[in-house]
C-alpha cells in the first residue's frame, strides 16, 4: 500500500539534489583556493542534517548552525552587492568585476542558488514531489529559512559602502517584502555600515525617469536612516552599456551617463 | 509655511470609535512617512502608530494593535487614524507628526484631544 | 515603564550647564538615530537635536552626544525660557516602534 505523502503547493525538491550540492561544493573549492580546506562530504551531510527527518514547515535557524560553520567564509566586508529581483544582472556584474561579492558567490549561496529541497518528518526521504511554498504553505520551510540565514549573515557581515541593485522595471522597486528589504536592510550593522548605495537599473530604453526619485526608494531611505546609515542611489539608465563599461572601463562612451 | 492639523478629536464612550484626521500643508506629504503620537493628561509622550511614504506599510504600538488603524491619502495630502472600541486608556491628546530621514520628527501638529469616558 | 529611561527632573540656574540622559539598548539608541524633543508648557513638541546635530533656528546652547546605548542632551547658559519637559526618542529595530524616553521636566531656579 503506498504510503500517504504530504501535498504542497511549491515543487519539490530538485533532481539530484545531493548530486548536484556536492558537485557544487567540489568546483567551488576547486576555484576558490581559500576553501580548499572545506570538506564537501561533511558539507553535504551538515546541508542534509537540517532538513532531513524533520516536518519541512518546521524548520529554524537554529537547524542550519552546523552547515554555516562548515561554510564560514571571509569576503572582503566593503566589496558586498546585494540585489531585489534582478539576481542575472549582479550575477553578470560580478563575474565582470570579479573584486566584489553577491551571496551567490559565496560557497553556501553557490551551493543552493535555484535549487529547492524538502524532507518529511520522521522519514530519511528527500521529498521530490512537493515543497511547501512561502505563501500558500508556511514561512519556516526549509529553502525560506536557509535563504533567511545565510542573508543575515552576509548582510551582518557587510561594511563601509554596500551596494544593491534594485529593478527599476518592478512597480515595487524597492519591495519590503523581499529578502533584502525584509531581512538585509535591517541586518546591515550601522557601527560598520557608512552608506547604503542602490543602484536602479531601467529597463526600457527610452525611459529616461530618475528612478531615485520612486517613492519606494524614499521609503528605502527613511528605514535605513532611522538606522543611521548614509542612502545614495544612481540611475543605471542603460544596463548593457553598465556592464560594458565594467569590462572596459577605457572606452570613450563610458564617460557619459550609463 | 509648514503645518500639520489634526481634527476629528471629540468625547467618546469606552468601546466607541473616532477617526482623527491630519491636514498637511506646506511641503510634499507623499515624501514623507507619517506618525501619530499622543500624550495622557500629565504623561510622557508615546508613539501610536507609523505608515509609510506609499502606505504600503504601517506600524503599530502593542497598546493600540488591532484596534487603531492608521492610513493616508495622498492626493487629499490628509493621514488618518481610525480609532475602535476605545479604552479609558486611550484618552489623550493626539498630535501627527511628519518623519524626515535622518532628522526625526521635525513637523508636529498643534494636536487634538481624545477623552474617553462614560 | 519607558523603553528609554531618563531622570523624571532636573534644574539649574540661569547660566549654568545641565545635562540629561537617556539610556537604552543596542536595539534603539545603540544601532539608530536618537532625537531629543523639547515640549514648552501648553504646546506641542519641538525637534530640538537628530543624530547629535541641531536643526536650524536651535540655539547652538544645546547639543546632544551618544556613546554606546546612552544619550545625552547638554543645555550650557541656561535660561528660563528652557524651562520644559525633554523627551529623547530613537527608532527601535526588535520592536519596530518609535520609543520615548518617560520624559525630564527641566525647571531653571
Known amino acids: 500500500v503506498p504510503r500517504w505523502r504530504q501535498q504542497w503547493s511549491g515543487p519539490g525538491t530538485t533532481k539530484r539534489f545531493p548530486e548536484t550540492v556536492l558537485a557544487r561544493c567540489v568546483k567551488y573549492t576547486e576555484i576558490h583556493p581559500e576553501m580548499r580546506h572545506v570538506d564537501c562530504q561533511s558539507v553535504w551531510d551538515a546541508f542534509k542534517g537540517a532538513f532531513i527527518s524533520k516536518h519541512p514547515c518546521n524548520i529554524t535557524e537554529e537547524d542550519y548552525q552546523p552547515l554555516m560553520k562548515l561554510g564560514t567564509q571571509t569576503v572582503p566586508c566593503n566589496k558586498i552587492l546585494l540585489w531585489s529581483r534582478i539576481k542575472d544582472l549582479a550575477h553578470q556584474f560580478t563575474q565582470v568585476q570579479r573584486d566584489m561579492f553577491t551571496l551567490e558567490d559565496t560557497l553556501l549561496g553557490y551551493l543552493a542558488d535555484d535549487l529547492t529541497w524538502c524532507g518529511e518528518f520522521n522519514t530519511s526521504k528527500i521529498n521530490y514531489q512537493s515543497c511547501p511554498d512561502w505563501r500558500k504553505d508556511c514561512s519556516n520551510n526549509p529553502v525560506s529559512v536557509f535563504w533567511k540565514t545565510v542573508s543575515r549573515r552576509f548582510a551582518e557581515a557587510a561594511c563601509d559602502v554596500v551596494h544593491v541593485m534594485l529593478n527599476g522595471s518592478r512597480s515595487k522597486i524597492f519591495d519590503k517584502n523581499s529578502t533584502f528589504g525584509s531581512v538585509e536592510v535591517h541586518n546591515l550593522q550601522p557601527e560598520k555600515v557608512q552608506t547604503l548605495e542602490a543602484w536602479v537599473i531601467h529597463g526600457g530604453r527610452e525611459d529616461s525617469r530618475d528612478l531615485c526619485q520612486d517613492p519606494t526608494i524614499k521609503e528605502l531611505e527613511s528605514i535605513i536612516s532611522k538606522r543611521n546609515i548614509q542612502f545614495s542611489c544612481k540611475n543605471i539608465y542603460r544596463p548593457d552599456k553598465f556592464l560594458q563599461c565594467v569590462k572596459n572601463p577605457e572606452d570613450s562612451s563610458c564617460t557619459s551617463e550609463i | 509655511e509648514v503645518q500639520l492639523l489634526e481634527s476629528g478629536g471629540g468625547l467618546v464612550q469606552p468601546g466607541g470609535s473616532l477617526r482623527l484626521s491630519c491636514a498637511a500643508s506646506?511641503?510634499?506629504?507623499?515624501?514623507?512617512?507619517m506618525n501619530w503620537v499622543r500624550q495622557a493628561p500629565g504623561k510622557g509622550l508615546e508613539w501610536v502608530s507609523s505608515?509609510?511614504?506609499?502606505?504600503?506599510?504601517?506600524y503599530y504600538a502593542d497598546s493600540v494593535k488591532g484596534r487603531f488603524t492608521i492610513s493616508r491619502d495622498n492626493s487629499k495630502n490628509t493621514l488618518y487614524l481610525q480609532m475602535n472600541n476605545l479604552r479609558a486608556e486611550d484618552t489623550a491628546v493626539y498630535y501627527c507628526?511628519?518623519?524626515?530621514?535622518?532628522?526625526?520628527?521635525?513637523?508636529w501638529g498643534h494636536g487634538t484631544t481624545v477623552t474617553v469616558s462614560s | 515603564q519607558s523603553v528609554l529611561t531618563q531622570p523624571p527632573s532636573a534644574s539649574g540656574t540661569p547660566g549654568q550647564r545641565v545635562t540629561i540622559s537617556c539610556s537604552g539598548s543596542?536595539?534603539?539608541?545603540?544601532?539608530?538615530?536618537v532625537n531629543w524633543y523639547q515640549q514648552l508648557p501648553g504646546t506641542a513638541p519641538k525637534l530640538l537635536i537628530y543624530?547629535?546635530q541641531r536643526p536650524s533656528g536651535v540655539p547652538d546652547r544645546f547639543s546632544g552626544s551618544k556613546s554606546g546605548t546612552s544619550a545625552s542632551l547638554a543645555i550650557s547658559g541656561l535660561q528660563s525660557e528652557d524651562e520644559a519637559d525633554y523627551y529623547c526618542?530613537?527608532?527601535?529595530?526588535?520592536?519596530?516602534?518609535?520609543?520615548f524616553g518617560g520624559g525630564t521636566k527641566l525647571t531653571v531656579l
Open positions: 507628526a511628519n518623519y524626515k530621514s535622518y532628522y526625526g520628527m521635525d513637523v
Open positions: 506646506g511641503f510634499t506629504f507623499s515624501d514623507y512617512e
Open positions: 505608515i509609510s511614504i506609499t502606505g504600503s506599510w504601517t
Open positions: 543596542r536595539s534603539n539608541i545603540g544601532t539608530n538615530l
Open positions: 543624530n547629535v
Open positions: 526618542a530613537a527608532w527601535d529595530d526588535s520592536l519596530n516602534a518609535w520609543v
